[in-house]
């Protein structure tokens, strides 16, 4: 999480700040959505439990050519301790369920806001 601020950051970003910034980006995506997000692309649903940041990234990284979620993908990579590449799948994916990116983002946002309110940042 120390790298989330990027090169311009004066120092490590507190986990609560990093989570708040991710939430704000997801809010931004949901509020600015006019046409179907990522052309209605479908992604694997995930279990919103421990390890969900990597699972979320593994799902979203398979969506290509969608500038709206590029910043989210970068931010999620800061929460995931290992390198994630397209085609990777963890046990946290609900492998028989695909949902639209817009719904995925909405579900993720709701869960992250509750984690923030409860003080669970890692």
């Amino acid at each position: 999480l120390t790298c989330l601020g990027g090169f311009a950051s004066p120092g490590p970003v507190p986990p609560s700040t990093a989570l708040r910034e991710l939430i704000e980006e997801l809010v931004n995506i949901t509020q600015n959505q006019k046409a179907p997000l990522c052309n209605g692309s479908m992604v694997w649903s995930i279990n919103l439990t421990a390890g969900m940041y990597c699972a979320a990234l593994e799902s979203l990284i398979n969506v290509s050519g969608c500038s709206a979620i590029e910043k989210t993908q970068r931010m999620l990579s800061g929460f995931c301790p290992h390198k994630v590449s397209a085609g990777q799948f963890s046990s946290l994916h609900v492998r028989d369920t695909k949902i639209e990116v817009a719904q995925f983002v909405k579900d993720l946002l709701l869960h992250l806001k509750k984690l923030f309110r409860e003080g669970q940042f890692n």
């Epitope: 989570l19 869960h111 806001k113 923030f116 309110r117």
Partner: antibody, heavy 120, light 112 residues
């Protein structure tokens, strides 16, 4: 229009049980937290506990843990307060309230309250 | 548990008066996410409480500007700059930072 409506209050004997309901409309309870708060006659407000209906994560004031149980039914868009081993001092108006939906910073909507009287 | 101590428990005032209610927490109510979840609620007899102020100093939508909140750490204040007839009620502070959440004992504002 957002609304919370409590029901299930009434007269119960000491040692008895009661289940209060909080029916929500105008929003999905999974999107927020539902809290239970009570107020004894002429007294102040007491926070009992809350539930996150999205995952059944429940927190209580330890004072109520064990005797009181909070639950939710997402299909019915309702939350519940099961009260067991009731005592005279549990006589109060019981309210449900929701956390606002943006950052869950405060209680923006409350029910009208339901009166529970514990007496023989 | 965090105790929220309100003072005074009651006060008599006249329309137009400036009223100040204080609330002291037994320990810091700064949440681990950096926010201070200190709220003020107004309650009238037979009615559910209504939110006035959240996160110490933010006025809830529709709340008149005569209501203001301030404070930090463990000491907080609700001020009514010019008391109106509809303001006679009981006021509660509330901390939503640390579970179990807790209310203050209330301050009843009565007509002098």
């Amino acid at each position: 229009e957002v609304q919370l409506v409590e029901s299930g209050g009434g007269l119960v004997q000491p040692g008895g049980s009661l289940r209060l309901s909080c029916a929500a409309s105008g929003f999905n309870i999974k999107d927020t937290y539902i809290h239970w708060v009570r107020q004894a006659p002429g007294k102040g407000l007491e926070w009992i506990g809350r539930i996150d209906p999205a995952n059944d994560n429940i927190k209580y004031d330890p004072k109520f843990q064990g005797r009181f149980t909070i639950s939710a039914d997402n299909a019915k868009n309702s939350a519940y307060l099961q009260m067991n081993s009731l005592r005279a001092e549990d006589t109060a108006v019981y309210y449900c309230a929701r956390s606002e939906e943006n950052w869950y910073d405060f209680f923006d909507y409350w029910g009208q309250g339901t009166l529970v009287t514990v007496s023989s | 548990d965090i105790q929220m101590t309100q003072s005074p428990s009651s006060l008599s005032a006249s329309v137009g008066d400036r009223v100040t209610i204080t609330c002291r927490s037994s320990q810091s109510i700064v949440h681990s996410n950096g926010n201070t979840y200190l709220e003020w609620y107004q309650q009238k007899p037979g009615k559910a409480p209504k939110l006035l102020i959240y996160k110490v100093s933010n006025r809830f939508s529709g709340v008149p500007s005569r209501f203001s909140g301030s404070g930090s750490g463990t000491d907080f204040t609700l001020t009514i700059s010019s008391l109106q007839p509809e303001d006679f009620a009981t006021y509660y502070c509330f901390q939503g930072s640390h579970i179990p959440y807790t209310f203050g004992g209330g301050t009843k504002v009565e007509i002098k």
